[in-house]
Interface confidence: low
């Protein structure tokens, strides 16, 4: 808005100038003398009315009549000066059909640099590149940055080195970084960021040997800067078909089995595992500064073992030319997938006969002759792909007597099993 030239400006005092640093509090004042009812004084910044101005208006009559002259003083308070407060300030009044504006006053910001962004604490792997950020502004501009590492400038002078982003090609020891912002008013120093150097992630995690209940693994340690590795930690978790882990989830789906390894050597035997079970394993190594990141989960599997115990509750009875043998699955761990049972029997002074029964837990043997072979004994063993488990103790073939309870399964005859003839009977 512009005042018209038709009438003399009512303003007798115009806003002054304020120049200061951020946070400064100041007041702009304008004064006018008007006849009749005092108008409301508006404040403009760069030509725009300030709707939410912190202004106070004082009105003093110069006579006793309302139509006499009035002195009107408006004060605009600027609290905590910011960049957004800078500009040209004027007072504006509407008198009748005319608009009047005062002469301008100026608010400027000038002081030490102000940080918009400062370097942050972080951890980095040894000898690994990273970036730090720092940003400052005036006015006055320009603002130059000087980066310092462990309080030593990284350039001969501000602005000669990197500016907003500092690229560090790698560290071998925990270091501090800060930046100084310089302008014509002086220097402001940022917070000091501590960059902690951790060991690099171990590499080449691999299996050295496998047993049904243990795995021996080895890895190559990463660089750890000037800090020797104190130990490495290995975690194993049941894969549960790898759900979650293979999908890249960072944490295992259940509480992992954790073991610590003294280093060197960078090798560890993980015991107390389940045979024939898929696991995922990972390793991290630690120095005095903290642990490295974990390696990716490596899928491994314990091999099958043989059953650890013989079949249970073996009973063998004979009725004429038939022998009935039955048993129950071993109570001891199978250490793998049960593929079946082997049965061996032998009479006194006769060679042993070995049979593969498959997965059934009973067999009916057709004996030739009258079955008069004496001291016939039977042994049973369970087997997996890894081999036979321990054989049961020999069970003598007992004659069946009327009234004796027959074993539940002994009447189930294996049709595909041929009758065995004993030529020496």
């Amino acid at each position: 808005p512009r005042g018209t030239q038709a009438e003399e400006s009512p303003f007798v005092g115009n806003p002054g100038n304020i120049t200061g640093a951020r946070g400064l509090t100041g007041t702009l004042r304008c004064q006018l003398q008007v006849q009749g009812e005092p108008p409301e004084v508006h404040w403009l910044r760069d030509g725009q009315i300030l709707e939410l101005a912190d202004s106070t208006q004082t009105q003093v009559p110069l006579g006793e009549d309302e139509q006499d002259d009035w002195i009107v003083v408006s004060q605009l308070r600027i609290t905590s000066l910011q960049l957004s407060d800078t500009g040209q300030y004027q007072c504006l009044v509407f008198l009748g059909h005319q608009t009047f504006v005062s002469q301008p006053g100026y608010v400027g910001l000038e002081g030490l640099p102000y940080f918009l962004e400062e370097p942050e604490d972080r951890t980095v792997a040894a000898n690994t590149p990273f970036n730090l950020s720092c940003q400052a502004q005036g006015p006055p501009e320009p603002v130059d940055l000087l980066w310092l590492q462990d309080a030593v400038p990284l350039a001969t002078a501000p602005g000669h080195g990197p500016q907003r982003s500092l690229h560090v090609p790698g560290l071998n020891k925990t270091s501090s970084f800060s930046c100084e912002a310089h302008n014509a008013k002086g220097v402001t120093t940022s917070r000091t960021a501590t960059i902690t150097v951790l060991p690099q992630q171990p590499r080449n995690l691999h299996l050295v040997s496998r047993q049904p209940t243990e795995l021996e693994v080895a890895w190559t340690p990463g660089l750890s800067g000037i800090y020797p590795l104190t130990h490495c930690t290995l975690q194993a978790v049941l894969s549960d078909d790898g759900m979650g882990i293979q999908a890249g989830e960072p944490d295992p789906p259940e509480e992992p089995l954790t073991s610590q390894a003294s280093v060197p050597p960078h090798q560890l035997r993980l015991g107390s595992l389940h045979p024939h079970t898929p696991y995922h394993i990972r390793v991290a190594c630690t120095s005095s500064q903290g642990p490295s990141s974990w390696t990716h989960w490596l899928p491994v599997e314990t091999p099958e073992g043989v059953p650890l115990g013989p079949p249970e509750n073996i009973s063998a009875t004979r009725n004429g030319s038939q022998a009935f043998v039955h048993w129950q699955e071993p109570r001891a761990p199978l250490q793998g997938t049960l593929l079946g049972y082997r049965l061996a029997y032998q009479g006194q002074d006769t060679p042993e006969v070995l049979m593969d029964i498959g997965l059934r837990q009973e067999v009916t043997l057709e004996l030739q002759g009258d079955g008069s072979v004496s001291n016939l004994t039977v042994c049973v063993a369970a087997y997996t792909a890894a081999g036979d488990g321990p054989w049961s103790l020999p069970v003598p073939l007992e004659a069946w007597r009327p009234g004796q309870a027959q074993p539940v399964h002994q009447l189930v005859k294996e049709p595909s099993t041929p009758a065995f003839s004993w030529p020496w009977w």
Partner: antibody
Amino acid sequence: QVQLVQSGPGLVKPSQSLSLTCSVTGFSISSGYYWNWIRQFPGQKLEWMGYRSYDGSNNYNPSLKNRISITRDTSKNQFFLKLNSVTSEDTATYYCARGWLLHYTMDYWGQGTTVTVSS
Amino acid sequence: DIVMTQSPSSVSVTLGQSASISCRSSRSLLHSNGFTYLYWYLQKPGQSPQLLIYQMSNLASGVPDRFSGSGSGTDFTLKISRVEAEDVGVYYCGQNLELPLTFGGGTKLEIK
């Protein structure tokens, strides 16, 4: 207002040391800026000699590196130039100046001290 | 070291007329941060040098806007739009891109 006032002898004998003092008022030399020495030879040519930084570090012109030393006394807010083994080639007007921390742009200068090296 | 070359060595101007002084650097003074690290000083007779312009085109505090600086990475010009009597003296360009700081040989401005 920042002021730099120089003092020191105007005549030095060859092979001796040239020593000048720059006294600063209106700003602490340990609070910021670079505190420089510049010289102007009789033919008007200007040569930057070196600075002492607010943090106590130094930087010298390689052409003078073996002969120059810039020190300071923060309690007196003064900094000093010492140039060893002078010859007639070192005859010049010596200025101290405050360098901005914006690439050393020098905004305040001392009044200058004319030093003649002669036996 | 970066070599600064000024021309002409002297210039004679009528009061109220404009004057231009040239300066050339042996290497570009444009920094990757976008600033060009060239400044201009005026040394009035019997006085110490005073800063006129820094970073090629920024007017130092208290310097009248009759002075302006422009240029590219290696070629620079100081222009005085309406020369006044108080402008006489020797004008120096200098670079502060890197140490050692180096100066031009100076251009003497005289009034016709």
